[in-house]
Every structure is written in C-alpha cells, then in structure tokens.
Interface confidence: low
C-alpha cells in the first residue's frame, strides 16, 4: 500500500480564476496517493548534459462541472534529495505526483542541470489510475555511474501548457582522485627555482596532494588541491609526481622528469660528401643537446701539413641543416676537421676528427712564351710554348688546350685542340685565308683548365703569299702582337 | 590493493647471474616506486635499489652499481632484477617491496638466492 | 651514504613491559623520512612507522615512533606475545636508502 503523504505546497495558479460552479478546497493538502490498481508503464527518456537546477512549483487545477469543488494544487512529492554513492555503482531514483484524472495526456520529463534528458535512458513513467486521480510515478536508473553523472535531476509534468515542476534530487558520484592537471617534464638551468603545479578533484572533496621527488615525497604533510611546488634548485635530473588522496583512496600523477640543461654533447659522425679543390662539403650527426636547443655550430679546419703553422680556421654556421661547405681551402692538400655546437649553457667538445683532403686544382699560371707562325707550305699554323711553372697544388700536368679563333670579313670563329703534356708544340690547319688568327693556349691537369696565355695573333694572307716571322707572346706589359703580313 | 608475487627460490653457481622476478597483481598498473632489498641469512636488511616503472629510472646501492640491472615489462605487469658475477656472500633472500598508498607499504613474500659451488 | 646506528642490538623484556629503540643517523634525515620495520622469521619486513612518528594502516596504537633529525625512537608501550621480532629502521630522505643493523626485541 502506499501511505498519504500530507505536504506544505506554496500554491501557484495555474489558471486565472475558478471555473464554472467549482468549489475551493484546501490549497495545503496535496491528493493522496491511490491504491495500486493497475498502472500503465511508459517509456520515457533520458542521460546527461548540464545546466542550472530548477526550483519546484505547483499547479492549482480547477474542475468545470456545475457543483463540483475546487481541486488542490498539483505538485510533485518530496523525495529525497541528495544521493551520494561510489563511481560504477546503480542508481535509481524518482518523483511521483498525483494528478486528477480531468487531465488527459499528462507527461513527465527528467532532465539534468537544466538541460532535458533525450535519448536512451533509463526512464520509466508509471501510472496507477483511481476514481478521482492518477498516481504517476516516474523512475529514472543510472547502471555503472560515473563523474558526468554527477549533477541536480528534476522532473517536469506539463499540464494545460503549464509546467509542474519537482524539487532537485542531487547525485554526487564519488570516486577516486581526478586530474585535472599533472606536472610537466621540463628542462631547467641548474640551481635555478622552477614551479610543478598539480590539481586534482573529487568527489569526495577535500583532495590532498603529495609531491614525490625521486620516490620521496617532497612534503610531509599534503596540500589541499591545486598544489603549487616550488622547487628552490636542482644540481642533477630529478622525477616528480604528486599523490592525490581523498577518502576513497589514492591516484598518482605520471612521473615527470626534470633535467638540468648542460652543454651538448660533441657532434658524432662527421662525414665527407663532397670534396673539390678549394672546398669540402660535410655533414654530422648533432649530439644529445643537453636539453636546451642548439644555437649554432663552429667547423675547426686544421691544415695537416708538417711545414703549415697548425693554425685553426674556424667557421661559424646555422646549428641546421648539419651541413657546411667549407671554402678556401688550398687544393689537393690534407685537412683534420671536428665540428662542435653550442647551446644556451655553452659549446660542446669537438666531435672526433675527421681527415679529408682537396682534390688537384687547375693551374694557376699560363704556358710561357707561345709563339705562332705560319707555315704556307703545309697550310699550317705551328704554334710552340714553354710548360708553365705549375704549383704541386695544380696536380700533374695531363696536357694543353689551344684555343684558335678564326675572323675574316665579321665572321668568327673559334676551335679548340688538346694536346698532351709532353708536347710543348702543335700544328693547326688553315681554317680561312685572308684572315686572323688568334691563338691561347692552357695548361690542364686533373683539376681543371688553368687561364690562357695572353693571345698571339697572327693573320693568314690569301694562297701566294709567303712570310715565316712569328707571332709569339708579348713581354708583359705590351699590348696584344699583330703580325701583318 | 595491491599485491606483490615473486619467483621461486633459485641456485646459482659463482659467476652466474641471476634474475628475480616480482609480479603486481591487485592493481596491475605498476605505476609506484619498486624497492629491491636483500637479507643474508642471520644478518639486516640491505638496500639494493630503486625502479620506477613509469619512466624507467633505476638508483642502485653503490655497492651494486655495474652488477645490478631493474627492469620491468608493462604487459604483464612484472618488475625484475638481475644480479651478475655471483659470489657466495650474495646469498640471501632478495624482497621487492612498493609504497602503494602514502601510508602503505607493501612487500613481496621474497626469493630465496643461493650461490654455492 | 647515511649510515643508521640502532641501539640495543638485543632486547630482554617480558610480556606487558615497554620497549624502547633507537636509531641515530649519521647526518640529518631529510624531511624525518625515517621508517620503521617489524620482521618475524621467515617474513618479509612489515612496516610500523613512517615519516618518523605516523602509524601505517592496520598497526595498532601501542606502536610509536618519535624523534626528527639525527635521533629517532620507536617505542612498543606494553609488549604483546606478537611483538617479539626484529625492528629495523630505514631512512628513505636520500639515496641510497639506508637501514639500520636491526635491533632484536625477544622474550625475558
């Protein structure tokens, strides 16, 4: 059976004014609730979103029929109104109203911090109809609760456009210790303070936090949440992670790690790509950083050279990409090159060296003494030069280029002829009668073409003519020769 | 609550090594501090060394430092410790122990080690 | 390393009677991260006292510790038939952790 409740409700009209022929009753008493004598389950709706909880009102109903009393106000029936349990338990709870069975079409909707729960939810609407009223209850089941449970759930009737609506019933989830905040790793200058900050809640409340550094704890006693550490200093890495106790236990934050940024480690594997005669272009593999990022590198050239002075060249560059071409460099000599970096707290040792040598240059000076004549019985140019004075740096002389330019008449042009080292002579045909010929010559090695002697020119005369004076290579300082014929 | 569970007792020759494992169970996120700590027969307690199966940080006792090795496998929620270059005076029962809650601790039911030629 | 001295090394005492036990630390024990440890033959260590003077879960009152810095006590204030065992101090403030040689409490 279930017992009359008699309660205090404030009431609230629903209507302007009594109707037709009713009669008033007291507005106090609230309708008792019927004997069970059938009910009609209907589904409802439900879960979570939040809100503002409502506060409860009444509905004062009035009946039309001539002679019949005034109906007390509607309002749900008090309930309890706090429910605290533990996270992954069950809940059920519910509101219950009795409501005159002159109104059709009643319905009862739950919602949560102020926001109706739509969808999938346990929500049950019971009815047990009687003579005068319907006793409706509306039950509303939570399996497995969690956190976002948590929150103020009211009932709401709709009658005639008007809104009944029950006290809140309050459902506190309590569980072990949330973080909303944990410590993060960082990288600290040495004995320099640094703040950890570590929050975390409940329910239940109040949260207390241990602070644990290298499996100690750093406080003896615990801190209400949020904590703020305040470490003074540190001379080597240390791990950090608070403890969050409430009455339902313990929860720990993740180990975080603190290091003390140091100067980098050295640079490994310093690597050749690329070498030419006056530049070597390398690579490295950046050492550990020691926490505190890379500013920039120096590459340290030392000429490996018993008769150089050991000097070092230094060049600065870009700590990335890990690549520098070194430049002015001599050719086909031996260098040691280390790379070393820096970071805000300083540079680091020099990576292991490394040897790397230049390739054989060009030469650096011309064939001596070129001299051009023409020989008309053959129709040829000969042309002769002594070797040049070339540096061991140039490499080994593999032969000559000869450049011979041909004009006549605003035509030109120019051929090119290699010979080997060993000759120190060269015959060229005739390309154009009645022409001039301008001649240069260049030494070769493995390294490249060295510069051109200073050109010797010599005019070609048309067939019949005949003059044996050579051309040859000026004393310095004299303009370009010209043999005319 | 957590519970710690080690392996069986083990005989060693001198020279050998050899590697006690320490299972969580209870709670399988190992996520505290892991104490190994050792007691010759007749004699204390003697501190070994520090595990902290987060981030994989060891501390170990001086007088084990190059001999001693704590590591852990998160899959199946054991911590182990390997001891090397066995002597005689290594014999003991050698205990993994964790601080569960701050006021808590707990130990496990320890691993006999015998080193005998 | 921080080296703990406990004194007695033995203890006579009846049934009833209090025990007292020190631990004495060769440098200052950070923080009075000083613990203390009950072990019975064939058991491991069971822990009694941490943070110097507060009781872990489940260890009855008649178990105490007191004391800060170098100088700590433990002390049994009517000894119980379950309380002779070996008592350990450990200092956990550094590393390495240390602990004391043990002092035996056994039956008069």
């Known amino acids: 059976a279930i017992t009359e409740a008699r309660e205090e409700a404030k009431p609230y009209p629903l209507f302007p004014g009594p109707l037709p022929g009713s009669l008033q009753t007291d507005h106090t008493s609230l309708l008792s609730l019927p004997h069970t004598s059938g009910y009609q389950p209907a589904l409802m709706f439900s879960p979570t979103q939040p809100g503002r909880p409502y506060t409860g009102n009444v509905a004062i109903p009035r009946v039309t029929s001539a002679g019949s009393k005034l109906l007390p106000p509607l309002a749900f029936k008090h309930t309890v109104g706090h429910i605290i349990l533990s996270e992954h338990k069950d809940v059920k709870f519910n509101c219950s109203i009795s409501v005159p069975n002159i109104y059709q079409d009643t319905t009862i909707s739950w919602w949560k911090d102020g926001k109706e729960l739509l969808g999938a939810h346990h929500a049950i609407t019971q009815f047990y109809p009687d003579d005068e009223v319907t006793a409706i209850i509306a039950s509303f089941s939570i399996t497995s609760v969690q956190r976002s449970d948590n929150g103020s759930y009211i009932c709401k009737m709709k009658i005639n456009n008007e809104e009944i609506v029950s006290d809140p019933i309050y459902i506190e989830v309590q569980g072990l210790p949330h973080f909303t905040k944990q410590p993060e790793s960082m990288n600290v200058t040495r004995n320099t303070a640094f703040n950890l900050t570590c929050q975390a809640v409940g329910p239940p409340e109040p949260v207390n936090i241990f602070w644990v550094q290298n499996s100690s704890r750093v406080n003896e006693q615990p801190e209400k949440s949020p904590s703020v550490l305040t470490v003074p200093g540190l001379t080597e890495m240390a791990v950090f992670s608070c403890e969050a106790h409430n009455d339902k236990g313990l929860t720990v934050s993740k180990g975080v790690q603190i290091n003390i940024k140091a100067i980098p480690s050295p640079p490994t594997e310093v690597s050749i790509h690329n070498s030419t005669a006056h530049s070597i272009l390398i690579s490295w593999v950046p050492g550990f950083d020691g926490y505190s990022p890379f500013r920039n590198c120096s590459v340290q050239v030392k000429e490996v050279d018993p008769l150089s002075n050991g000097s070092v060249m230094i060049f600065n560059t870009s700590a990335s990409p890990h690549m520098y071409q070194i430049k002015q460099l001599q050719a086909l000599a031996n260098y040691s090159i280390g790379v070393s970096c820096m970071n805000e707290i300083g540079w680091s040792a020099v990576s292991p060296w490394i040897l790397a040598s230049t390739t054989e240059g060009a030469p650096s000076v011309a064939p001596l003494n070129v001299t051009v004549f023409l020989n008309e019985s053959r129709d040829n140019v000969d042309i002769r030069w002594m070797k040049p004075l070339t540096k061991r740096q140039a490499g080994e002389l593999v032969g000559y280029r000869i450049s011979h330019v041909w004009q006549s008449a605003g035509i030109s042009k120019e051929l090119l002829e290699e010979v080997g080292q060993n000759n120190s002579r060269a015959q060229i045909s005739v390309q154009v009668h009645n022409a001039t010929c301008t001649v240069r010559i260049a030494a070769v090695t493995k390294g490249g073409v060295g510069p051109f002697s200073d050109p010797v020119k010599i005019f070609i005369p048309a067939h019949g003519w005949v003059d044996h004076a050579p051309s040859s290579t000026p004393a310095p300082g004299n303009a370009d020769p010209v043999l005319i014929i | 609550q957590v519970q710690l569970v080690q392996s069986g007792a083990e005989v060693k020759k001198p020279g050998a090594s050899v590697k006690v494992s320490c299972k969580t169970s209870?709670?399988?996120?190992?996520?505290?501090?892991m104490y190994w700590v050792r007691q010759a027969p007749g004699q204390g307690l003697e501190w070994m060394g520090i595990?902290?199966?987060?981030?994989?940080?060891?501390t170990y006792a001086q007088k084990f430092q190059g001999r001693v090795t704590m590591t852990r496998d998160t899959s199946t929620s054991t911590v182990y410790m390997e001891l090397s270059s066995l002597r005689s005076e290594d014999t003991a029962v050698y205990y993994c122990?964790?601080?569960?809650?701050?006021?808590?601790?707990?130990w496990g039911q320890g691993t006999t080690v015998t080193v005998s030629s | 390393e921080i080296v703990l001295t406990q004194s007695p090394g033995t203890l006579s005492l009846s049934p009833g009677e209090r025990a007292t036990l020190s631990c004495r630390a060769s440098?200052?024990?950070?923080?009075?991260?000083l613990a203390w440890y009950q072990q019975k033959p064939g058991q491991a260590p069971r822990l009694l006292i941490y943070?110097?003077?507060s009781r872990a879960t489940g260890i009855p009152d008649r178990f105490s510790g007191s004391g800060s810095g170098t100088d700590f006590t433990l002390t049994i204030s009517r000894l119980e038939p379950e309380d002779f065992a070996v008592y350990y101090c450990?200092?956990?403030?550094?590393?390495?952790?240390?602990f004391g040689q043990g002092t035996k409490v056994e039956i008069k």
């Open positions: 595990l902290n199966p987060n981030q994989d940080q060891t």
């Open positions: 122990a964790t601080t569960y809650r701050y006021y808590m601790d707990v």
């Open positions: 943070g110097a003077s």
């Open positions: 450990q200092q956990y403030g550094s590393s390495p952790r240390t």
């Open positions: 209870g709670n399988t996120q190992i996520r505290y501090y």
């Open positions: 440098q200052s024990v950070r923080s009075n991260y």
